[in-house]
Amino acid sequence: SPKHHSQRARKKNKNCRRHSLYVDFSDVGWNDWIVAPPGYQAFYCHGDCPFPLADHLNSTNHAIVQTLVNSVNSSIPKACCVPTELSAISMLYLDEYDKVVLKNYQEMVVEGCGCR
Amino acid sequence: SPKHHSQRARKKNKNCRRHSLYVDFSDVGWNDWIVAPPGYQAFYCHGDCPFPLADHLNSTNHAIVQTLVNSVNSSIPKACCVPTELSAISMLYLDEYDKVVLKNYQEMVVEGCGCR
């Protein structure tokens, strides 16, 4: 029924997924050494890793096992929703001599999330 | 002092690290299809990912950024303690014809944990 569908949709929305997160370097005190950009879209991962773990939750065998163990023993934590794919961004920063340096920073932007 | 040392050790012990977890396949209902072994040492990851993230917490640049953002905006979650290195185990299982098959299962055992 439509009611069941909306409940499912709401429940599904609570599952592990990528969320928007714009990081302004001035908010975290990095604007004194990062010249450009002034911030970037980092994203973050958040949400439930429920039993049983569905395929789209991009999990490992260990996460499947741990989720199963948690279902019979809650003292063992569920798997956690974390970045499973990350990409790089380029930034201009000031080195110790106040020189502007262009550097590629690895693993800065979340491209995908999963239960691990 | 010894008291301070034990407090530090206890606090340090709360940080993200690997914990023992023996999975007995009969406890999770897998003994009907897994022939051997009867269980295995899977380990699991658990603990805090505090600000600032120390080197030994094996984090990504994104985790460092997210931890920093969490320190100024608690609505963004901290990084999560998860397996960062996993290894395989071999298991004997029964296939659909009740034949015993030896298979290598990837990503079954936690070798290392980190904040992600």
Epitope: A36, P37, P38, M91, Y97 | -
Partner: antibody
Framework: QVQLQESGPGLVKPSETLSLTCTVS????????WSWIRQPPGKGLEWIGY???????RYNPPLKSRVTISVDTSKNQFSLKLSSVTAADTAVYYC???????????????WGQGTLVTVSS | EIVLTQSPGTLSLSPGERATLSCRAS???????LAWYQQKPGQAPRLLIY???SRATGIPDRFSGSGSGTDFTLTISRLEPEDFAVYYC?????????FGGGTKVEIK
Amino acid sequence: QVQLQESGPGLVKPSETLSLTCTVSGDSISSYYWSWIRQPPGKGLEWIGYIYYSGSTRYNPPLKSRVTISVDTSKNQFSLKLSSVTAADTAVYYCARICSSTSCWGWFDPWGQGTLVTVSS
Amino acid sequence: EIVLTQSPGTLSLSPGERATLSCRASQSVSSSYLAWYQQKPGQAPRLLIYGASSRATGIPDRFSGSGSGTDFTLTISRLEPEDFAVYYCQQYGSSPLTFGGGTKVEIK
């Protein structure tokens, strides 16, 4: 296209605070760094500082103790305050845009037409 | 800070001639982060060149920039009457951002 217009008093007394505003039209103030540059009569150019729409600033060290640059995104404006002025602060004051991307950061384009501020009693 | 020295202070040339303006930095300008501007009397500076050699939008191809490290050059291949002005270099490879003292190109 984007246009910048400086406004503010043309005469300021010594020891007082110089206040100027730059109004940006034709573009959102939220996508770039916004800068102030000055030019004493018959002399060269001096960068004062810049601001991002979030309020993040960077100032020229010799002026840092006297300079405040602020932004009002609702009005698409940014402002300069220079305290404890002397005759040496007499100059044409320009506002200008700096690209905030790594691929185009650092040069000034476009500029406002400039406003002359004289410090005199 | 990086000090930029422009030479000559004044360049007296006739229309149609070639103008060569020099900008020397007190230390190496990283990644050729150098720009050139033209300023006419009573007007704001106008961006000509960025990245040492890239022409800004709408700038005629008689203007060209070259150089790296500490030595940079702005060349105007054939001077037009509207090119007589003051030219400034600016570095953005180090903080603070700094300008040269300018070169005046005047009619001979």
